[in-house]
Interface confidence: low
């Protein structure tokens, strides 16, 4: 998988998770999240050659499609696959909230 | 949705469904294929502003982030989001046989 | 994609109490962050901030006009109400709503605008 | 509550003029600071947001620079359809408007 265990101990090209903090006030203009002050989101990016992580038979075709006409520019993406939510405190007015917040971490990747 | 019905009658820079015809045997050198000799397999390119077509919180949380911090290289990608078979008829010898692949063409596309 | 609609009275009369619908399409408010303002606009002047509804149902309203404003919504239907009382001939504004992208503060995407003018 | 103040009021410029319109917050408001550009009978539309961040679509000769108390609206070199009322909006503490800025054809 294309995840922290592989991505984050090898240094590579094509598609893999990678490492990326977001501070909410900072990074978003978010400043109604109370704690935490960030999380680490990370994101998904690099190249997808030929049957790198491919999701479906339609990335597949097209990552064969691009080496075969490398000028084209129809080619798969380096895209999340797994996410985690992520658990948030704000305040409505004095009253603390907690909410978990879906689909906010990346956990690993795909070529699709 | 980001579909044929919307894209193709609409110039958009911003991710969409982009229409792309596959020849088998020419595109993919796939010579096991008697028929179809190639089809509409379309992808989906395009860029991913803030809050375009969405997949994710991640993706939006991404897309407001690389909004905010241009230089950065973190951002979604336009990527296929509904997919459907292809029927095809392809040779075991003498013997016809009838298959669909799943996944091989793209109806309309996210960003993610 | 994101599209908002107002809808309302025209015409009030002085006294009486205005409702508006905003009917929105493209997000929903159960998305967590989402939220809903309204802004007016009497004729030929600048835009005023009357109130706004979260997905949370956390509210807030202009202090001016606090008294006068209540803020709803109804998930289900993708729609936002906003009732004001005692309406004035200096309440004839467009009305607009937009939306608001988790607690932002500037409205991405606006409605047309309603046109309400207070008259006897 | 905050009082945003624009200026000017009103200007007259050509096309291809650089055009630069202020705001000023009456206390600290950080960058939460937006800028809208309305057209006569249309709902405004929004252009910079975090006082220097542009809105995807908006075209680059449109920047937002400030923080704190003051804000400034540049437009590098102005085109027909940018006449227009501009609009700087704090969202520090509620959310309020200025006056607007009429940018006319000289």
């Known amino acids: 998988a294309l995840d922290a265990a592989y991505c984050f101990r090898n240094v590579q090209d094509n598609c893999c998770l990678r490492p990326l903090y977001i501070d909410f006030k900072r990074d978003l203009g978010w400043k109604w999240i109370h704690e935490p002050k960030g999380y680490n989101a990370n994101f998904c990016a690099g190249a997808c050659p030929y049957l790198w992580s491919s999701d479906t038979q339609h990335s597949r075709v097209l990552s064969l499609y691009n080496t075969i006409n490398p000028e084209a520019s129809a080619s798969p993406c380096c895209v999340s696959q797994d996410l985690e939510p992520l658990t948030i405190l704000y305040y409505i007015g004095k009253t603390p909230k907690i909410e978990q917040l879906s689909n906010m971490i990346v956990k690993s990747c795909k070529c699709s | 949705a980001l579909d044929a019905a919307y894209c193709f009658r609409n110039v958009q820079d911003n991710c969409c469904l982009r229409p792309l015809y596959i020849d088998f045997k020419r595109d993919l050198g796939w010579k096991w294929i008697h028929e179809p000799k190639g089809y509409n397999a379309n992808f989906c390119a395009g860029a991913c502003p803030y809050l375009w077509s969405s997949d994710t919180q991640h993706s939006r949380v991404l897309s407001l982030y690389n909004t905010i911090n241009p230089e950065a290289s973190a951002s979604p990608c336009c990527v296929s989001q509904d997919l459907e078979p292809l029927t095809i008829l392809y040779y075991i010898g003498k013997t016809p046989k009838i298959e669909q692949l799943s996944n091989m063409i793209v109806k309309s596309c996210k960003c993610s | 994609q994101v599209t908002l609609r107002e809808s309302g009275p025209a015409l009030v009369k002085p006294t009486q109490t205005l409702t508006l619908t905003c009917t929105f399409s493209?997000?929903?408010?159960?998305?967590?962050?989402?939220?809903v303002g309204w802004i007016r606009q009497p004729p030929g002047k600048a835009l005023e901030w009357l109130a706004h509804i979260y997905w949370n149902d956390d509210k807030s309203y202009s202090t001016s006009l606090k008294t006068r404003l209540t803020i709803s919504k109804d998930t289900s239907k993708n729609q936002v109400v906003l009732t004001m009382t005692n309406m004035d001939p200096v309440d004839t504004a467009t009305y607009y709503c937009?939306?608001?992208?988790?607690?932002?503060?500037?409205?991405?995407?606006w409605g047309q605008g309603t046109l309400v003018t207070v008259s006897s | 509550d905050i009082q945003m103040t624009q200026s000017p009021s009103s200007l007259s410029a050509s096309v291809g003029d650089r055009v630069t319109i202020t705001c000023r917050a009456s206390?600290?408001?950080?960058?939460?600071l937006n800028w809208y550009q309305q057209k006569p009978g249309k709902a405004p539309k929004l252009l910079i947001f975090?006082?220097?961040s542009l809105q995807s679509g908006v075209p680059s000769r449109f920047s937002g620079s400030g923080s704190g108390t003051d804000f400034t609206l540049t437009i590098s070199s102005l085109q027909p359809e940018d006449f227009a009322t501009y609009y700087c909006?704090?969202?520090?503490?509620?959310?309020?408007f200025g006056q607007g800025t009429k940018v006319e054809i000289k």
């Open positions: 937009a939306r608001d992208f988790y607690y932002s503060g500037y409205f991405d995407s």
């Open positions: 493209g997000f929903s408010l159960s998305t967590s962050g989402m939220g």
């Open positions: 206390q600290d408001i950080s960058n939460y």
């Open positions: 975090g006082a220097s």
């Open positions: 909006q704090q969202t520090n503490t509620m959310n309020t």
